[in-house]
């Protein structure tokens, strides 16, 4: 417990002390006083530097003093042999004896007692940065006018922080200039502008003067910019050493200028304003930036628009362009969007053909359709190259979007038809020598494939059968080999209006109009033994002249059976009309007169005994087409005959082509169109 | 008649493997994108993954993609599904469909059931 | 992705009866490639209405579908027996994925 005076005592005074002790006082007065230590009496054994016996005064790691030997006062009218003054407010007292003394010592009294100590003056280093003020245990410092003193009750500085500067535009200067700065200060302005808006600081070489830095280089007196985590100096010297134009990047800058004791200068003037903060004019491949600006600021909005063939994809969507903002941290919203080429993805299937894989399905990419050779060909043209586009579809040149359409080859047989003389004059035949025959179970005839969805055949076999069975791609009918063959489920029988129905069709003798389709419910699939016969055209090409020769097939009688269980064909001319008139019907079942013959009939035969007969009805009388040798069209149907074995009836197909494609049309799905 | 046969499914364990197959006839197999599709018991429809007629190019849902990968053998008229590191929530009839114009899938088979419990 | 809704979810209606089967688009979709598909307890399901409008073979007349942009319909003029079945819609965007409607169940009240 810190005490205001003491007394001090060797062991034993004021008789001898013993040898060989070691004693120490701790001396401590209140804070703010300093020591006042004084010996009365000192008897010590002397000896050199006091190395046997002493007294020792230490004052923190400061010996201030070893004493021995005897003293007496030098002033009769003071006790006082030996003195100490320190201004701490701690000592120790240290009392040491050797093993042996030759005489007898009394040792020592010494008194302390707590004194002021002057703080301003008793010190090297200076307390206060302006004005000391002592009293008795203590000291207070004080400033100046205008200054006022720091939390650390030693330093005076001038009141220059705390200011915050929100105008987009305004200008700083130090205290007092031009005059000289406070010494000893620290300032702090804050600029806080609105966000999206930089700080950009400016400042004239002459408006600076600062205590310039010392020979380390390390400025005494600085100017300090601090934006987010950049910073701009420390300066100093006399002229702005550093930029004339700071861009800060920020919407916040503190300035901090820092002062020490010495050297004043005038200080430091600058203006500062607000700019929008910039953003980069970054580069966006595959695009275009509108509008285009040499320098994009806060608030600037761009339109980004991908060259064709590239996209930006966002959530699986993709869109030719996006928005792009500036934003006050000085980035682009958006930024993690990129123009990319468009895929087109995988390309669509098409019905009997194919399309090869590409390498990509990017933008440019080349893909070519093709159809199922040689059963089918590309109806539509465009010569099935298609390119990856722009808008994400596949392209043609000629169609666009279109996809190719692979329509049937029509009236091409895979093995053409060699006479073998056999049938009713006719010959064996193989159904890939007629891939159009199709086969009618009840009533037992035929009948004309014409395309995927159509059958063609006389209106006379369908009459009394509006859902017949049909079959395709067998040369025999069989049972058994019906079971393989494929089967066709008719839809919709359409009967040609012109065509009179009677109570009793036995009794027949008109069979102008005899024509019908047989709409499919599913298309067929075309291949060597099953394929479409072509329908005539419309030109004078294919008018029938007399001798030019057709071809007949079917599975009717012959002479020696009433149904034949193989394909059978014939080659027979075209006869005159009249050749028909003039045959006697076999089994008449009317007048002679009563049998209606008219220009939709073509009469065909007489050679050889070639005829169709009953059970070839509806199928095609196949005639070689005028303007294309390597197909066949269906000039007629099997239709009636007076007399099996010499001329037979056929519907002349040409005068029902409008009907035929009319009906079609009418009656198709959309997969036809 | 265009037929789509599915096999290859059963029960399996989370983090399990299995692998699925189509075997397709009566069409060109090889002239046709095919797609596998799934339905969770009592759920809806979900589209799975898509490849192109050669094989080069395939698309698989983001949840499963990395997991399972399709695949084809045009000569033996099979597409596949290998799946990987199967969980519980992958549970569901697995379909094959062909893909036909304007990628409608015009023929599906009748699917094959994958079970993911422990 | 595309997410499509399809309302309701259940359709109680008579044979006889006129339905009506939503489907919406959560973004605009090309008609072409918006189909439509039917399926029964326990089979698979059948292409029913490609295209928007198109029906598939074997798909009775009295079905039609329209629609365009994200609002697609499939109606049937005079329910049949026969039609009672949950029905889909789908589409395809080439930069996938494939997204289906979590279907209509058409049943008889």
């Known amino acids: 417990e810190p005490t205001m005076y003491g007394e001090i005592l060797s062991p034993n005074y004021p008789q001898a002390y013993p040898s060989e002790v070691e004693k120490s006082w701790d001396i401590e007065v209140p804070e703010g006083y300093g020591i006042h230590l004084y010996f009365t009496h000192l008897d010590i054994e002397l000896s050199e530097n006091c190395a046997y016996d002493s007294v020792q005064i230490i004052s923190g790691d400061t010996e201030e003093g070893r004493l021995c030997g005897q003293r007496s006062s030098n002033n009769p009218h003071s006790p006082i042999v030996e003195e100490f003054q320190v201004p701490y407010n701690k000592l120790q007292v240290i009392f040491k004896s050797d093993f042996s003394n030759e005489e007898r010592f009394t040792g020592f009294a010494a008194y302390y007692v707590a004194t002021d100590i002057n703080e301003c003056t008793d010190f090297v280093d200076v307390p206060c940065s302006h004005f000391c003020n002592n009293f008795i245990g203590g000291y207070f410092c004080s400033c100046p006018p205008e200054y006022f003193l720091h939390d650390d009750m030693k330093n005076c500085g001038v009141n220059c922080s705390g200011d915050v500067f929100t105008a987009l535009i305004g200008e700083i200067a130090s205290p007092n200039y031009p005059k000289p700065y406070p010494e000893n200060s620290r300032c702090e302005y804050q600029i806080r502008l609105e966000k999206g808006f930089q700080v950009v600081v400016t400042l004239r070489r002459e408006d600076f003067d600062v205590e310039a830095a010392d020979s380390a280089g390390n400025c005494l007196d600085s100017l300090v910019f601090v934006a987010g985590d950049r910073q701009f100096g420390p300066y100093c010297g006399h002229g702005f050493p550093g930029p004339l134009n700071i861009e800060t990047k920020s919407n916040a800058l503190d300035i901090i200028f820092q002062t020490d004791l010495t050297g004043q200068k005038k200080g430091w003037k600058l203006r500062y304003h607000g700019d929008p903060m910039p953003c980069p004019k970054e580069d966006t491949p595959n695009s275009v930036w509108e509008p285009a600006k040499a320098k994009y600021v806060f608030r600037d909005v761009v339109q980004i628009t991908c060259l064709d063939g590239f996209e930006v994809v966002e959530g699986r969507v993709g869109a030719t362009s996006f928005y792009s903002t500036c934003q006050s941290n000085g980035k682009w919203s958006n930024s993690k969007l990129k123009c990319q080429p468009v895929d087109c993805g995988i390309p669509e299937s098409i019905e009997n053909g194919k399309v090869e894989d590409p390498e990509s399905t990017l933008f440019g990419s080349v893909i070519r359709y093709t159809c199922e050779e040689p059963y089918y060909y590309m109806e539509n043209g465009g010569g099935g190259e298609y390119h990856c586009a722009g808008n994400g579809s596949w392209v043609n040149e000629v169609l666009g979007p279109e996809l190719p359409k692979c329509v049937p080859v029509c009236g091409v047989p895979r093995e053409p038809f060699e006479e073998k003389q056999r049938i009713i004059g006719g010959s064996d035949a193989d159904i890939k020598n007629f891939p159009w025959q199709v086969f009618f179970d009840n009533p037992w005839a035929g009948g004309a494939l014409i395309n995927e969805y159509w059958v063609l055949t006389a209106a006379h076999v369908v009459e009394g059968n509006r859902e017949p069975t049909m079959y395709v791609g067998s040369t025999s009918v069989q049972t058994s080999r019906l079971a393989k063959s494929k089967m066709l489920t008719p839809e919709h029988v359409f009967i040609h209006p012109g065509w009179k129905l009677l109570e009793v069709p036995e009794g027949r003798t008109n069979f102008d109009n005899d024509i019908a389709l047989v709409r499919l419910k599913d298309p067929v699939k075309m291949g060597p033994t099953v394929s479409p016969i072509c329908l005539p055209g419309t030109s004078s090409d294919y008018n029938l002249m007399d001798g030019d020769l057709g071809l007949i097939s079917g599975w009717g009688r012959t002479e020696k059976r009433d149904r034949a269980v193989r394909l059978k064909a014939a080659r027979l001319p075209v006869a005159p009309l009249r050749k028909c008139k003039e045959v006697k019907v076999e089994k008449p079942t009317a007048d002679a007169e009563a049998y209606v013959f008219t220009p939709n009939m073509i009469c065909a035969g007489g050679e050889k005994g070639m005829d169709s007969c009953k059970g070839d009805s509806g199928g095609a009388f196949a005639v070689q087409d005028p303007n294309d040798k390597t197909k066949f069209y269906a000039a007629g149907l099997v239709s009636w005959g007076p007399q099996c074995g010499t001329y037979g009836l056929y519907t002349r197909v040409k005068n029902y082509v409008d009907w035929i494609m009319k009906t079609m049309q009418e009656n198709s799905t959309p997969r036809e169109d | 008649e265009v037929m789509l046969v599915e096999s290859g499914g059963g029960l399996v364990k989370p983090g399990g493997s299995l692998r699925l197959s189509c075997a397709a006839s009566g069409f060109e197999f090889e002239n046709y994108a095919m797609s596998w599709v799934r339905q969770a018991p009592g759920k809806g429809l979900e589209w799975v993954a898509t490849i192109s007629s050669g094989g080069s190019h395939t698309y698989e849902l983001d949840s499963v993609d990395g997991r399972f990968t399709i695949s084809r053998d045009n000569s033996k008229d099979t597409l596949y599904l290998q799946m990987n590191s199967l969980r519980a929530e992958d549970t569901a009839l697995y379909y094959c469909?062909?893909?036909?114009?304007?990628?409608?899938?015009?023929?599906w088979g009748q699917g094959t059931l994958v079970t993911v419990s422990s | 992705q595309i997410v499509l809704t399809q309302s309701p979810a259940t359709l109680s209606l008579s044979p006889g009866e006129r339905a009506t089967l939503s489907c919406t688009a959560s973004?605009?979709?090309?008609?072409?490639?918006l189909h439509w598909y039917q399926q029964k307890p326990g089979k698979a399901p059948k292409l029913w209405i490609y295209?928007?409008?198109n029906l598939a073979s074997g798909v009775p007349s009295r079905f039609s579908g329209s629609g365009s942009g994200t609002d697609y319909t499939l109606t049937i003029s005079s329910l049949q027996p026969e039609d009672f079945a949950t029905y889909y819609c789908h589409q395809y965007y080439r930069l996938h994925p494939i997204t289906f409607g979590q279907g209509t169940k058409l049943e008889i009240k």
């Open positions: 295209s928007t409008s």
């Open positions: 973004s605009e979709v090309s008609s072409s490639y």
């Open positions: 469909a062909r893909l036909f114009t304007k990628h409608a899938m015009d023929y």
